[in-house]
Interface confidence: low
């Protein structure tokens, strides 16, 4: 099992017994669009525009997801797209609320095992590779709603039914209450609230802030784990360099995470993953001889 894999990597084991983003509304700049004597004005934002073929992508992903996951076969993907669209179309892209996404949340209600949840921060690819192998564990992007929106950008315009393919608000430079940020805040909060028992989080040991209070994990998920349901948060710190044998569980930001979690009456534990490639290989093939002996 996983414990053998950790052992084989000589993983250190450490038992441990809101921050809010700065919100501001950027007005964006108005630039003329189109030709003729009466120019049509369009909001110009600092971030990239809506992903090309966004509606088609969401619809196609929904169909694919519901085909692969029998328990979601009842989902009507056209209704899902309508609800998604309704959350941001014709609305000012700096004035989106969690409430705008509720029709979509409702349609995306899904059962995933609450004790098999893997959170991640700034190390998405490895987290997803892990759940592709360890099929009984789930990241947010393994749920319908997370899968639909993963890596996509979208926004609309106030009082028009158009999708803005030119630019969308940047979280820092323009405003935090934009369609993409509010979506991830909403689904992340609900995902964390649903977690129980032992919750795992994968953290990037190569970054200066291994735990970042400003990340979605640090600002949303940590604060929405339910102490009466979650017993332990177990952090997996992923090392980047092959010769890196430091104990990153002693990093000041990990100690900060431990402090936040402990104050919420949730136990904290931390493990170093010194060899992520080896770790994944051993998850795939736990019987491999190198996975049961120390390396």
């Amino acid at each position: 099992g996983l414990n053998d894999i950790f052992e084989a990597q000589k993983i250190e084991w450490h038992e441990g017994s809101h921050h809010h983003h700065h919100h501001h509304h950027g007005s964006g700049s108005l630039v003329p669009r189109g030709s003729g004597s009466v120019p049509r004005w369009r909001q110009q934002w600092s971030g990239p525009g809506t992903t090309k073929r966004f509606p088609e992508t969401v619809l196609a992903r929904c169909v694919k997801y519901t085909e692969i996951h029998p328990e979601m076969r009842h989902v009507d993907c056209q209704s899902v797209w309508d609800a998604f669209k309704g959350a941001f179309i014709s609305k000012h892209p700096c004035n989106i609320t969690e409430e705008d996404y509720q029709p979509l949340m409702k349609l995306g209600t899904q059962t995933v095992p609450c004790n098999k949840i893997l959170l991640w921060s700034r190390i998405k690819d490895l987290a997803h590779q892990f759940t592709q192998v360890q099929r009984d564990m789930f990241t947010l992007e393994d749920t319908l709603l997370g899968y639909l929106a993963d890596d996509l950008t979208w926004c609309g315009e106030f009082n028009t039914s158009k999708i803005n393919y030119q630019s969308c608000p940047d979280w820092r430079k323009d405003c935090s209450n934009n369609p993409v940020s509010v979506f991830w805040k909403t689904v992340s909060r609900r995902f964390a609230e649903a977690a129980c028992d032992v919750v795992h989080v994968m953290l990037n040991g190569s970054r200066s802030k291994i735990f970042d209070k400003n990340s979605t994990f640090g600002s949303v998920e940590v604060h929405n784990l339910q102490p009466e349901k979650v017993q332990t948060l177990e952090a997996w710190v992923i090392h980047g360099g092959r010769e890196d044998s430091r104990d990153l569980c002693q990093d000041p930001t990990i100690k900060e995470l431990e402090s936040i979690i402990s104050k919420r009456n949730i136990q904290f534990s931390c493990k170093n993953i010194y060899r992520p490639d080896k770790f994944l290989q051993c998850v795939k093939n736990p019987e491999d001889s190198s996975c049961t002996s120390e390396i």
């Epitope: 969690e98 705008d100 949340m105 095992p113």
Partner: antibody
Framework: QVQLKESGPGLLLSSETLSLTCTVS????????VSWVRQLPGRGLEWMGR???????DYNSDLKSRLSISRDIAKSQVFLKMSNLKTEDTGTYYC?????????????WGPGTMVTVSS | QFTLTQPKSVSGSLRSTITIPCERS????????VTWYQQHLGRPPLNVIY?????PSEVSDRFSGSIDSSSNSASLTITNLQMDDEADYFC??????????FGGGTKVTVL
């Protein structure tokens, strides 16, 4: 800490309209769904309906024609209106907090309010 | 819409083990999580099991939940039965429209 409390008239006549208020504290109505559940004498629990955090409402199909649920976010209150009361509607009415994503489970309940409908 | 069927009553002697079944009429019991509530007379229901088999931290470990696909049922098991366990117990789930469905309730008597 999280609390819910139901209030409203305890005695009504047949054909009148029941109006109940659920006042919540310790959480926001824009973060959690609130449902109304009733318990008729000697019977089990019956889900009546809910208000979603976005303001949408769902109703039990058997009660839908008589039921209306609304809320006032500023006052942290959820309202239940049920028209055309019958004596069979006599029972205890609860409001309860639920949260989903994976599952619907009521983790906090109000103490309940007793409603008697007489003919 | 499916129904959840529970026995009207279950009894057990002090310190014994009892199991309360909750059978789903159609669709798979594993499709949607099951929650269990305990209700003492004159009190609101109390959540004792959620998400099929998870127990809130303040609830005694004598309570456990499980699901059995062969009988399409969920079960609540109480070990080392105590006098204070005498109460009504309700199972609850939800359908694909997220409508909440309760079982009819089971009265537990401690002999």
């Amino acid at each position: 800490q999280v609390q819910l409390k139901e209030s409203g008239p305890g005695l009504l006549l047949s054909s009148e309209t029941l109006s109940l208020t659920c006042t919540v504290s310790g959480f926001s109505l824009t973060s959690y769904e609130v449902s109304w559940v009733r318990q008729l004498p000697g019977r089990g629990l019956e889900w009546m309906g809910r208000v979603w955090i976005g303001g949408d409402t769902d109703y039990n199909s058997d009660l839908k024609s008589r039921l209306s649920i609304s809320r006032d976010i500023a006052k942290s209150q959820v309202f239940l209106k049920m028209s055309n009361l019958k004596t069979e509607d006599t029972g205890t009415y609860y409001c309860a907090r639920a949260y989903g994503f994976n599952y619907w489970s009521f983790d906090f309940w109000g103490p309940g309010t007793m409603v008697t409908v007489s003919s | 819409q499916f129904t959840l069927t529970q026995p009207k009553s279950v009894s057990g002697s002090l310190r014994s083990t009892i199991t309360i079944p909750c059978e789903r009429s159609s669709g798979d019991i594993g499709d949607n999580y099951v929650t269990w509530y305990q209700q003492h007379l004159g009190r609101p229901p109390l959540n004792v099991i959620y998400a099929d088999d998870q127990r809130p931290s303040e609830v005694s470990d004598r309570f456990s939940g499980s699901i059995d696909s062969s009988s399409n049922s969920a079960s609540l098991t109480i070990t080392n039965l105590q006098m204070d366990d005498e109460a009504d117990y309700f199972c609850q789930s939800y359908d694909s429209n997220t409508d909440i469905i309760f079982g009819g309730g089971t009265k537990v008597t401690v002999l």
